[in-house]
Interface confidence: medium
């Protein structure tokens, strides 16, 4: 049993590996890794990548084995896989390994970034989208506004980021965000750096994008009018005698 040989995929299908209460936990929490085989098994093994010998064995005549990790430490985090075997298989033959389960044991998740799309300067009536981006999928994201105690917006996301839409008129202000695991025990990220959303400064000497567009349109109108006047004047001067518009 020390050197598992893995047969072809169709031979003994892979089991499923899950963690309870979660795959992201704080140190000191008791974690149960559950290995569920598609058929009753006799022995289950929990493996860490690169290691031939199972980290833990469970001898159970059923489809489910539980591996208990008591009061986990950050060192126990990492990748886990499980395999199962039956007594009628050859020596050292295990099933296909389960998909990798990543266990993260941490007091705090990494700080997310907070950016404004398309940018932190908003024009009157324009909406702005704030993206809070962490490093982990399936997290809950929280957006805060300086001076407001309660969270401004709160959303769960399957992606490692969440987008929050702010209405233009109410957008200016100072914002920060964080994310956390979606169920207990809640593990929080550090709070993001603050992001300041401000009004577009229409009184400045630089032309804003809107003014540039208006100026461009006015220029086009003037050029068009000039072209028409020139065309009309030339056509009148070329007209044959006796013909007048």
């Amino acid at each position: 049993d020390i050197t598992p040989s893995v047969p072809p995929a169709s031979y003994h299908p892979k089991p499923w590996l899950g963690a309870q209460p979660a795959t992201v936990v704080t140190p000191g929490v008791n974690v149960t890794l559950r290995c569920r085989a598609p058929q009753p098994a006799w022995r289950f093994g929990l493996f860490k990548p690169g290691e031939i010998a199972p980290l833990l064995f469970r001898d159970v005549s059923s489809e489910l084995a539980e591996f208990f990790l008591e009061e986990v430490t950050p060192a126990q985090g990492g990748s886990y896989r499980c395999c199962y075997r039956r007594p009628d298989w050859g020596p050292g033959v295990w099933s296909q390994p389960s998909d990798v389960l990543e266990l993260l044991v941490t007091e705090e998740l990494p700080r997310p970034s907070l950016v404004a799309l398309p940018g932190p300067v908003v024009g009157p009536g324009a909406n702005v989208s704030l993206r809070c981006a962490g490093r982990l999928r399936n997290m809950s994201f929280v957006l805060y506004r300086e001076g407001v105690a309660a969270p401004l917006q709160y959303r769960h996301s399957a992606q490692p980021w969440a987008d929050f839409t702010l209405l233009g008129a109410r957008a200016p202000g100072t914002y920060s965000c964080y994310y956390h695991t979606p169920s207990a025990p809640y593990v929080l990220s550090q709070r993001s750096e603050v992001l300041v959303i401000s009004w577009e400064d229409s009184g400045s000497s630089d032309y804003t994008r809107g003014n540039l567009v208006r100026l461009g349109l006015a220029g086009l109108v003037l050029i068009s009018l000039g072209a028409l006047v020139t065309f009309d004047w030339r056509s009148q001067n070329r007209a044959p005698a006796g013909i007048r518009p």
């Epitope: 209460p21 979660a22 309660a150 956390h180 025990p185």
Partner: antibody, heavy 118, light 107 residues
Framework: QVQLVQSGAEVKKPGSSVKVSCKAS????????ISWVRQAPGQGLEWMGK????????NYAQKFQGRVTITADKSTSTAYMELSSLRSEDTAVYYC???????????WGQGTMVTVSS | EIVLTQSPGTLSLSPGERATLSCRAS???????LAWYQQKPGQAPRLLIY???SRATGIPDRFSGSGSGTDFTLTISRLEPEDFAVYYC????????FGPGTKVDIK
């Protein structure tokens, strides 16, 4: 193991408010959610709302929105549920519950009987 | 909101018999978020099963849960005298709801 101890029974007049407390001991209070569930005499269980103390985030059942306020004091590991504009139908046992296993409630307080009567 | 319906309302059985309790949801429930509780008169509910099929700490193996989607089942393989009680199913997504309960009483 976490234990939840609730405040004693209350008798209230219709239209008044009641505030029930739930003190946690023996575990990490702020990292978990505290939910409030009530049970009218001879009836089933009804989830009212929850608070995640570490986040300060609350989530209320639609039915109780605007009438219930759940708060938490991290310094004393105590959660509170205040229900306002009481009516006779609010007569029930109010439980606080703590989900340590995903969000299923495996730790429960002993319950607080609230009677609303004129 | 997800509405849970339990059947039967009352189940009259003798000790040693097998009990099968059903819970049906008005819309699909992730099996990660379905639980079963037992409640005896004058006591708080007790968690039996979570994640549709995982037994909570200290729960005897005569209790088992199964199902997915909208149909879930709690099975008590051999009823012991202490198992006569009311059983509730619960979905615990963003706004948890409970079923109305099934009373298991002695025939």
């Amino acid at each position: 193991q976490v234990q939840l101890v609730q405040s004693g029974a209350e008798v209230k007049k219709p239209g008044s408010s009641v505030k029930v407390s739930c003190k946690a001991s023996g575990g990490t209070f702020s990292s978990y959610a505290i939910s409030w569930v009530r049970q009218a005499p001879g009836q089933g269980l009804e989830w009212m709302g929850k608070i995640i103390p570490i986040l300060g985030i609350t989530n209320y059942a639609q039915k109780f929105q605007g009438r219930v306020t759940i708060t938490a004091d991290k310094s004393t590991s105590t959660a509170y549920m205040e229900l306002s504009s009481l009516r006779s139908e609010d007569t029930a046992v109010y439980y606080c519950a703590n989900p340590l296993t995903f969000d299923a409630f495996d730790i429960w307080g002993q319950g607080t009987m609230v009677t609303v009567s004129s | 909101e997800i509405v849970l319906t339990q059947s039967p309302g009352t189940l009259s059985l003798s000790p040693g018999e097998r009990a099968t309790l059903s819970c049906r949801a008005s819309q699909s429930v992730s099996s990660s978020y379905l639980a079963w509780y037992q409640q005896k008169p004058g006591q708080a509910p007790r968690l039996l099963i979570y994640g549709a099929s995982s037994r909570a700490t200290g729960i005897p193996d005569r209790f088992s849960g199964s199902g997915s989607g909208t149909d879930f089942t709690l099975t008590i393989s051999r009823l012991e005298p202490e198992d006569f009680a009311v059983y509730y199913c619960q979905q615990y997504g963003s706004s948890p709801t409970f079923g109305p309960g099934t009373k298991v009483d002695i025939k």
